[in-house]
Interface confidence: low
C-alpha cells in the first residue's frame, strides 16, 4: 500500500514517542562518534519535519524515501571528515548506495569509553531532574556501542530502564533496589545485542536463504501445533522484520514487527496454545515475549518422517517441482519433531537431505540412492551430543571461571593471532555456556548449548572481520553458517604460530587491582593467562596452572600487604622470574 | 592458497585393493576434518568417508562401510583411503575435501576404475 509520504505514514503509525526514539536509534547506530546533544538536535529537526507532512502530505521533500531523508540529514554534520574519515565519502553517492555505504562503515568494536555508572543517588536526581533526557541518553549511549541492536526491542528495554528507576528512586534503599535490576537489564542487553547480531550476519553474509531456513526450524519446534503454511507466512514475515531492522530501516522495522504480534494474538488458535499471556501484555511487552515464549506441546500423533521423504516414490517429483518448498517442508517436519536438537543441528541434517536429493534424484534408481539417507543423520546428531556432554562434565567439575579458563587456553592454542582482548571476551562468553546450559535436562542441553554457541562464536567472527588476522578464523567464519562451531571445534593447536616474544611489562601488576571488582579482576588473570599461552603455545595445562596459582597467590598477598606498590613491584619481579623458568621461557 | 592432489587412482580388477592419497597444503591440515567424495560418471557427488582433525573418529557411507577406511597422516599433510573388495560400482573420480560429510571438492580428484 503505497502513501504519498513515507515519513508521515510511519509518524503516524508509530506515534511522535516511539518515532524519535527510533530516529535516535538510527543516527546513533550510524553515527556512533557523534555526540549525543548533536543527535538530539538532529532528531527534532527531523521530527519536526515529519510533522508539517502529517499536516500535509503534498509539503516539500514529504515525498522523499526515508533513507534520503535521514541521509542527508547525517551528511549535514559538519565534522563527518574529521570524525569518520572515509566514511563521509559516502554522502558523494545517491541512495540506495549511499545506505549500504553507511551499513558498511558501522562499527562492532567502536573506539568508545566504557560506561561507568555513576552513584545511585546522582543518577535518581538526573532522572528526576530531566527524565526526558535520561532517556534518550540511555537509548543513546546503547545503539551507539550495539550498531545492529534489534531496534524495537531496544524500545522495551528502555521501558524497563524507566520503570526501574522509577520504582526504586523513591525506595528507602535505592542501592539495594536499582543495582540488581541494572545488572540484569546489561546482562540481557548484551545477549540480545549478540541475538540480533547473528541474525543480521545471518541475512547480510549467507543471504535471506540462510535466515528463513533458520527461521522455519525455530519456529516449527516452538509452534509444532501450526501448519507449514501457517509457519511459512509467519517465516516470510518475520524475514521482512528483520532484514529492515538490519538494514537502518527502523521505522519500518518497528510497524512490521507490531503489525506481525497483532497477527499472531488474533490467530493464536492456529498457532500455538502458549501466547494467551503475551497477548494480553501491552505492544512492547506483548513482542518480546512472543519473542521468547516457551515451545508448544508437540501434537502426539504426528507419523513418521520416513513415509514422506524416504520411502515415498515421488521424493523426487516433490523435490524437482519446488525444491525450497519441499528441503522447507522436511526441515519443518523434522524441526517440530525435535525440539531436543539445536536449530544449527536441524539445519545441518537438512543440508545433507539436500545434497542426498540432489545427487540421488540424478541417479539410475533414485530411490535405491537416497534409502539410507537418515543414516548419513546419526553421526551428525552424535557430534554435537558428545561434544555437549564432554564440556558439561569439564564445567561440573571446574566450575565457571577455572571451566573459563580452559576455553581460554583451548581457543588461544587454536588461533593465537587473534587479539588478547576479543579472545578473553569470547572464551568468558563460551564458558558461560555451562552455567546457562548445563542445568537444563538433556532434552534441553543442545538447543541451548549449540545456538548459544552460535551467538558467541558470531562475536568472534564479526570482531575479526574488522581486523582479519586468522585464515582460520575466516575460513570457520565464511564457509558456512551452521558448520561453525564444529569448524572451530575441530581446530586443533595452530603450528604454525611463531610464539610471541616474552614481554615482562605485559606481567607487571600495580595495586589498583585490588580495588576492583571480582570480575574485573577475573579478567586481569584471565588476559594474563592469554599472553602465557602466546608466549608458550605448548604449555601444558599442569604448567599454566601452576603459573596461574601462583599469580592468584601474589596478588592476593600484596592485597593484604601494608605498602601494596613496593609488594607488586619486589614480588612481581619474582613470579615473572619464576614463572619465566616454570614455562622454560 | 590450499590445494589437493589426489593421487593413486588406476585400473584395478573387482575384489582387487587401492591405497589412495591426497596431499594437502596451504592450510592447517592438521586442524580439519577431511573426506573423501566420489563422482561416478554420470551421476552426482558422493560421499564416501569422512574423518576428525585427530583422526580419532571415521564415518562411511553404508555402501563402502567394511570395505573402505580412512585414515590421515598429520605429519605428512596426508589423507589416505585404503579400497579393498572393490566393486564396479566403486569406478568413479574420487576426491578429497576439506570438512565433514557435506564437504564440497577442489581438487582435480584421481580415477579409479573397476572392471574386469
Known amino acids: 500500500d503505497a502513501h504519498k509520504s513515507e515519513v508521515a505514514h510511519r509518524f503516524k503509525d508509530l506515534g511522535e514517542e516511539n518515532f524519535k526514539a527510533l530516529v535516535l536509534i538510527a543516527f546513533a547506530q550510524y553515527l556512533q562518534q557523534c555526540p549525543f546533544e548533536d543527535h538530539v538536535k538532529l532528531v527534532n529537526e527531523v521530527t519536526e519535519f515529519a510533522k508539517t507532512c502529517v499536516a500535509d502530505e503534498s509539503a516539500e521533500n514529504c515525498d522523499k524515501s526515508l533513507h534520503t531523508l535521514f541521509g542527508d540529514k547525517l551528511c549535514t554534520v559538519a565534522t563527518l571528515r574529521e570524525t569518520y574519515g572515509e566514511m563521509a565519502d559516502c554522502c558523494a553517492k545517491q541512495e540506495p548506495e549511499r545506505n549500504e555505504c553507511f551499513l558498511q562503515h558501522k562499527d562492532d568494536n567502536p573506539n568508545l569509553p566504557r560506561l561507568v555508572r555513576p552513584e545511585v543517588d546522582v543518577m535518581c536526581t538526573a532522572f528526576h531532574d530531566n527524565e526526558e533526557t535520561f532517556l534518550k541518553k540511555y537509548l543513546y549511549e546503547i545503539a551507539r556501542r550495539h550498531p545492529y541492536f534489534y531496534a524495537p526491542e531496544l524500545l522495551f528495554f528502555a521501558k524497563r530502564y524507566k520503570a526501574a528507576f522509577t520504582e526504586c528512586c523513591q525506595a528507602a534503599d535505592k542501592a539495594a533496589c536499582l543495582l540488581p535490576k541494572l545488572d540484569e537489564l546489561r546482562d540481557e542487553g548484551k545477549a540480545s545485542s549478540a541475538k540480533q547480531r547473528l541474525k543480521c550476519a545471518s541475512l547480510q553474509k549467507f543471504g535471506e536463504r540462510a535466515f528463513k531456513a533458520w527461521a522455519v526450524a525455530r519456529l516449527s519446534q516452538r509452534f509444532p501445533k501450526a501448519e507449514f503454511a501457517e509457519v511459512s507466512k509467519l517465516v516470510t514475515d518475520l524475514t521482512k522484520v528483520h532484514t529492515e531492522c538490519c538494514h537502518g530501516d527502523l521505522l519500518e522495522c518497528a510497524d512490521d514487527r507490531a503489525d506481525l504480534a497483532k497477527y499472531i494474538c488474533e490467530n493464536q488458535d492456529s498457532i500455538s496454545s502458549k501466547l494467551k499471556e503475551c497477548c494480553e501484555k501491552p505492544l512492547l511487552e506483548k513482542s518480546h515475549c512472543i519473542a521468547e515464549v516457551e515451545n508448544d506441546e508437540m501434537p502426539a500423533d504426528l507419523p513418521s518422517l520416513a513415509a514422506d521423504f524416504v520411502e515415498s516414490k515421488d521424493v523426487c517429483k516433490n523435490y524437482a517441482e519446488a525444491k525450497d518448498v519441499f528441503l522447507g517442508m522436511f526441515l519443518y517436519e523434522y524441526a517440530r519433531r525435535h525440539p531436543d536438537y539445536s536449530v544449527v543441528l536441524l539445519l545441518r541434517l537438512a543440508k545433507t537431505y539436500e545434497t542426498t536429493l540432489e545427487k540421488c534424484c540424478a541417479a539410475a534408481d533414485p530411490h535405491e540412492c537416497y534409502a539410507k539417507v537418515f543414516d548419513e543423520f546419526k553421526p551428525l546428531v552424535e557430534e554435537p551430543q558428545n561434544l555437549i556432554k564432554q564440556n558439561c562434565e569439564l564445567f561440573e567439575q571446574l566450575g565457571e571461571y577455572k571451566f573459563q579458563n580452559a576455553l581460554l587456553v583451548r581457543y588461544t592454542k587454536k588461533v593465537p593471532q587473534v587479539s588478547t582482548p576479543t579472545l578473553v571476551e569470547v572464551s568468558r562468553n563460551l564458558g558461560k555456556v555451562g552455567s546457562k546450559c548445563c542445568k537444563h535436562p538433556e532434552a534441553k542441553r543442545m538447543p541451548c548449548a549449540e545456538d548459544y554457541l552460535s551467538v558467541v562464536l558470531n562475536q568472534l567472527c564479526v570482531l575479526h572481520e574488522k581486523t582479519p588476522v586468522s585464515d582460520r578464523v575466516t575460513k570457520c567464519c565464511t564457509e558456512s553458517l551452521v558448520n561453525r562451531r564444529p569448524c572451530f571445534s575441530a581446530l586443533e593447536v595452530d603450528e604454525t604460530y611463531v610464539p610471541k616474544e616474552f614481554n615482562a611489562e605485559t606481567f607487571t601488576f600495580h595495586a589498583d587491582i585490588c580495588t576492583l571488582s571480582e570480575k574485573e579482576r577475573q579478567i586481569k588473570k584471565q588476559t594474563a593467562l592469554v599472553e602465557l599461552v602466546k608466549h608458550k603455545p605448548k604449555a601444558t595445562k599442569e604448567q599454566l596452572k601452576a603459573v596461574m596459582d601462583d599469580f592468584a597467590a601474589f596478588v592476593e598477598k600484596c592485597c593484604k600487604a601494608d605498602d601494596k606498590e613496593t609488594c607488586f613491584a619486589e614480588e612481581g619481579k619474582k613470579l615473572v622470574a619464576a614463572s619465566q623458568a616454570a614455562l622454560g621461557l | 592458497q590450499v590445494q589437493l592432489v589426489e593421487s593413486g587412482g588406476g585400473v584395478v580388477q573387482p575384489g582387487g585393493s587401492l591405497r589412495l592419497s591426497c596431499a594437502a597444503s596451504?592450510?592447517?591440515?592438521?586442524?580439519?576434518?577431511m573426506s573423501w567424495v566420489r563422482q561416478a560418471p554420470g551421476k552426482g557427488l558422493e560421499w564416501v568417508s569422512s574423518?576428525?582433525?585427530?583422526?580419532?573418529?571415521?564415518y562411511y557411507a553404508d555402501s563402502v562401510k567394511g570395505r573402505f577406511t580412512i585414515s590421515r597422516d598429520n605429519s605428512k599433510n596426508t589423507l589416505y583411503l585404503q579400497m579393498n573388495s572393490l566393486r564396479a560400482e566403486d569406478t568413479a573420480v574420487y576426491y578429497c575435501?576439506?570438512?565433514?560429510?557435506?564437504?564440497?571438492?577442489s581438487g582435480q580428484g584421481t580415477q579409479v576404475t573397476v572392471s574386469s
Open positions: 596451504g592450510f592447517a591440515f592438521r586442524g580439519f576434518g
Open positions: 574423518i576428525n582433525n585427530g583422526g580419532s573418529d571415521t
Open positions: 575435501a576439506i570438512g565433514g560429510p557435506g564437504a564440497s571438492p
